[in-house]
């Protein structure tokens, strides 16, 4: 099935980083400066991916694969293959229409992306705050008052909380 | 594909509860967050609280604080929703949504949505 | 917390331009995300950010914000958009609250 298929079209001979070039008779050229293919048997090459202002080169354009871009310091990558580049916060902080703005009182957010999200009411869980929340921290909860009565055993503190942010990609 | 899929409907008495689940696929079950919003019949949209599967954590509206559990089993990618002292205005469809999220621009947006849950309180 | 308000109902032309509007003081400080919910279905996004698009909603959903004002427009309206819209953001407690929805009718 290859051989006839090869027989019936040249173009499917010509390896990645090749095209197959109609005006030289479909012979199998190389792609030019700044163009690649990542298949064989294509009939042009892409264009590389170019990465200016706030993106940087992290894996330079080869004739078999294209350029991949990250984000140049103070910025985070958004999107399938880091097609755009987003303002980093400072902890404490989130993105908002006007920029980076101090998490609210009441909020908090311990990573430089993501967005501010309320302290755990230690109370729905029958605790009590152990550890005041800031604007970069959780609050940390720890035993119910009853437990802290004289007699009670001494605390072990609690691990610590897992804050909200997302998982790191 | 991306699915959030949950719990058939539910009929209770007043003054029970109910347990509602979401079990999600098609993703890194840690990597985003599930909130749960509800529809009364003919209403809109009302938000009941958020979870973080990954760790735990919790946040829940006003409305609903001692009322509301979100919890979650990570073994089976599953979140729940349990809602006690049921009341006949708690009669709606309950869904679960999934916070855009992941490597996405946090725009505070429900990008996938469960089918819902009917759960009808009526003595 | 916060509230967000939407008319209750807006009608248009079959092909014509209709803006939902979504007000709220929250809206100074987060954008607003927009939900398409026809009878029977679960709510759909259908614009998030200021004018972001996900996939597979129509380049006719548009996005603008203005001050505590987000909108959501409809370039040449389709019989297949008429729907209830649903605003959403957060408030600056961490909370999200929904506006009460625009029932939208095409004409």
């Known amino acids: 099935f290859e051989r006839t298929r090869s027989l019936q079209d040249p173009c499917s001979n010509c390896p990645a980083g090749t095209f197959c070039d109609n005006n030289r008779n479909q012979i199998c050229s190389p792609c030019p400066p700044n163009s690649f293919s990542s298949a064989g048997g294509q009939r042009t090459c892409d264009i590389c991916r170019q990465c200016k202002g706030v993106f940087r080169t992290r894996k330079e354009c080869s004739s078999t694969s294209n350029a991949e871009c990250d984000c140049t310091p103070g910025f985070h990558c958004l999107g399938a293959g880091c097609s755009m580049c987003e303002q980093d916060c400072k902890q404490g902080q989130e993105l908002t229409k006007k920029g980076c703005k101090d998490c609210c009182f009441g909020t908090f957010n311990d990573q430089k992306r993501g967005i501010c999200r309320p302290w755990t009411n230690c109370s729905l869980d029958g605790k009590s705050v152990l550890v005041n929340g800031t604007k970069e921290r959780d609050v940390v909860c720890g035993p119910s008052p009853a437990d802290l009565s004289p007699g009670a055993s001494s605390v072990t503190p609690p691990a610590p909380a897992r804050e909200p942010g997302h998982s790191p990609q | 594909q991306v699915q959030l899929v949950q719990s058939g409907a539910e009929v209770k008495k007043p003054g029970a509860s109910v347990k509602v689940s979401c079990k999600t696929s098609g993703y890194n079950f840690n990597t985003y967050y599930i909130h749960w919003v509800r529809q009364a019949p003919g209403q809109g949209l009302e938000w009941m609280g958020i979870?973080?599967?990954?760790?735990?954590?919790?946040s829940y509206a006003q409305n609903f604080q001692g009322r509301v559990t979100m919890t979650r089993d990570t073994s089976t990618s599953t979140v729940y929703m349990e809602l006690s002292s049921l009341r006949s205005e708690d009669t709606a469809l309950y869904y679960c949504a999934r916070e855009l999220g992941g490597n996405v621009r946090r725009d505070d947006a429900f990008d996938i949505w469960g089918q819902g849950t009917m759960v009808t309180v009526s003595s | 917390s916060s509230e967000l308000t939407q008319d209750p109902a807006v009608s248009v032309a079959l092909g014509q331009t209709v803006r939902i509007t979504c007000q709220g003081d929250?809206?100074?400080?987060?954008?607003a995300s927009w939900y398409q919910q026809k009878p029977g279905q679960a709510p759909l996004l259908v614009m998030f950010?200021?004018?972001k698009r996900p996939s597979g909603i129509p380049d006719r959903f548009s996005g603008s914000s203005s001050g505590n004002t987000a909108s959501l427009t409809i370039t040449g309206a389709q019989a297949e958009d008429e729907a209830d819209y649903y605003c959403n953001s957060r408030d600056t407690s961490g909370s999200w609250v929904f506006g009460g929805g625009t029932k939208l009718t095409v004409l």
């Open positions: 979870i973080n599967p990954s760790g735990g954590y919790t």
């Open positions: 950010g200021e004018d």
């Open positions: 929250s809206l100074r400080r987060y954008y």
